[in-house]
Interface confidence: low
C-alpha cells in the first residue's frame, strides 16, 4: 500500500537526509587532508560517489509525495553511520591501510543503489506538477491520434482541473505553438466534454480566447493557442500534451 506519511513530515525527513549528506561532503572535502600516493584515487572515488549521491538526492527531493519510507529511513541511517565512522577516522585519515576507505566507498555505492530504487514519480522527460506527470509531444498529430498516443502510454490527452495547471500548460504551449488538449464537442455540438466524459466546468469558460468557441467550419476539438483556448478542426496536426497521475512507490 502507499505510504501515508504526511508531506510535511516526509519533507523534514528528506531535508534531514540532505543536511547529513551536505555535512558529510563538507567533512570529506575540507577537513580531510589531501593524501599522497595510492590512497589518493580511493579518496577521489569516495568524493565522486558522495557528489553523485548528493546530486541524485537533490534531483528527487522536490517531490515529497509517495516516496518509499523504508528506503528513505535506511539511507538516513546509513548516512548517520557513515558520518560517525568518517569523523572517528578523521585524525588518521588517510590511513596506510586502504581497507577502511574501501569500506566507506562500498557503503556509498550501496547507498547510491538504494537511492536509485526510490521510484521516479514521472518517467524521464515527463514534467511533474501538482501530483501529475505531463508529456509534451515533440511531434504533431490530429486530435484523435493524439488521444490514442496518450492512451498508448497509459495517460490521457490533458484534462485541466485547476487554474495553476491551466497557467502552466498555457505558458508552455504558447512557446511552442497550437497544442491539443483533451476537450471536444464531437459527441454533441456545443457540449464540451473532456476525454474522460466529464463536462467542461463553467469556471474554465474564462480561458476561451475572445470570440471562441466559434465553430467556424466544424471546429470540434480544443487547442491551447496563444494566451487561451481555441476550437479547431480535429483533423489538423498539432502538438499534444498527455497527463497521468504521478506514481507513488509501494512498500515491499
Amino acid at each position: 500500500q502507499v505510504s501515508k506519511t504526511p508531506n510535511t513530515e516526509r519533507q523534514k525527513e528528506q531535508e534531514k537526509i540532505l543536511q547529513e549528506l551536505t555535512q558529510l561532503t563538507d567533512e570529506l572535502t575540507s577537513r580531510i587532508p589531501i593524501s599522497q600516493g595510492k590512497n589518493e584515487s580511493m579518496q577521489a572515488k569516495i568524493t565522486e560517489q558522495l557528489m553523485q549521491l548528493k546530486t541524485e538526492l537533490l534531483s528527487r527531493i522536490p517531490i515529497f509525495q509517495g516516496q518509499n519510507e523504508s528506503i528513505q529511513e535506511k539511507i538516513s541511517e546509513q548516512l548517520m553511520q557513515l558520518k560517525a565512522e568518517l569523523l572517528s577516522k578523521i585524525s588518521s585519515f588517510p590511513v596506510k591501510d586502504d581497507s577502511k576507505q574501501e569500506k566507506i566507498y562500498q557503503q556509498l555505492v550501496q547507498m547510491k543503489t538504494e537511492l536509485f530504487r526510490l521510484c521516479r514519480l514521472c518517467p524521464w522527460d515527463w514534467t511533474f506538477l501538482l501530483g501529475n506527470c505531463y508529456f509534451f509531444s515533440k511531434s504533431q498529430r490530429n486530435w484523435n491520434d493524439a488521444v490514442t498516443a496518450c492512451k498508448e502510454v497509459k495517460a490521457q490527452l490533458v484534462i485541466i482541473n485547476s487554474d495553476e495547471e491551466q497557467t502552466f500548460l498555457q505558458q508552455t504551449s504558447k512557446a511552442k505553438g497550437p497544442t491539443w488538449m483533451g476537450l471536444s464537442d464531437l459527441k454533441k455540438e456545443a457540449t464540451w466534454l473532456w476525454v474522460d466524459g466529464s463536462t467542461l466546468s463553467s469556471r474554465f469558460q474564462k480561458y476561451w480566447n475572445r470570440g471562441e468557441p466559434n465553430n467556424i467550419g466544424e471546429e470540434d476539438c480544443v487547442e491551447f493557442a496563444g494566451d487561451g483556448w481555441n476550437d479547431s478542426k480535429c483533423e489538423l496536426k498539432k502538438f499534444w500534451i498527455c497527463k497521468k497521475s504521478a506514481t507513488p512507490c509501494t512498500e515491499g
Partner: antibody, heavy 110, light 94 residues
Amino acid sequence: EQLMESGGDLVKPGASLTLTCTASGFDVSGSYYSHWVRQAPGKGLEWIGMIYNGDGSTWYPSWVNGRFSISKTSSTTVTLQMTSLTAADTATYFCARDLGLWGPGTLVTV
Amino acid sequence: VGGTVTIKCQSSQSIVYNNYLSWYQQKPGQPPKLLIYQASTLASGVPSRFKGSGSGTQFTLTISDLECDDAATYYCAGGYDCSSADCFAFGGGT
C-alpha cells in the same frame, strides 16, 4: 538500463545494411522516442531520425531522402535500415533513448 | 585547471518550448554523455560545476572549477517543430 547497437560492417558502395539497437533493463515501447545519430570519423554528431515507440511514427531530417528507415521490431529492439550506401555514410552509428541514454555505437564503413 | 569556460550555442530558429536544448560531453571512442537537458536542468550524476542557461535561440554552457577530466568535445542539440523543420539538430561541437 542500457542500449547496444549491432550490425555495423564493412560494405561496398550501393549496398544495404540494417543496424539493430537492443535495450536492456527497459522496454522501448511507451513514451520514448528512439533516435539514431551518426558521427563520421573526426566529425560532429548528425541526427538521422527518430521513432515514437508508442505507435511507431517516424521522423527524419530532409537529407535522409528515403534512404534510411527506422522501425520498432520488438519490445526491446529498434532497427535502422540503410540503402544505397556511399562512402559519405561511413560513420559510427549511435542509438539513443530520448537523446539521454546512448549506446556505445557501431561502426559502418562503406 | 580551476578556471571557468563558457560555450555558446546559437540556433537559427526558435527551439521548441524555447528550452528544448541539451548539452553533451563526448570523449574520444565514447558515446556522447548528456550533461544538461531542457536548457538548464542538470542530468543525473553530473557535477553542479556544469551550468546551462538561455532561451529561444541563444544558449550557454558554463563549466566552472575546470578539471583535467573536463577535456572533451561539447555539443549542443536543439529540438524544433517537426512540421516546419528537421526535428533535431546538433551543433558542430567545441
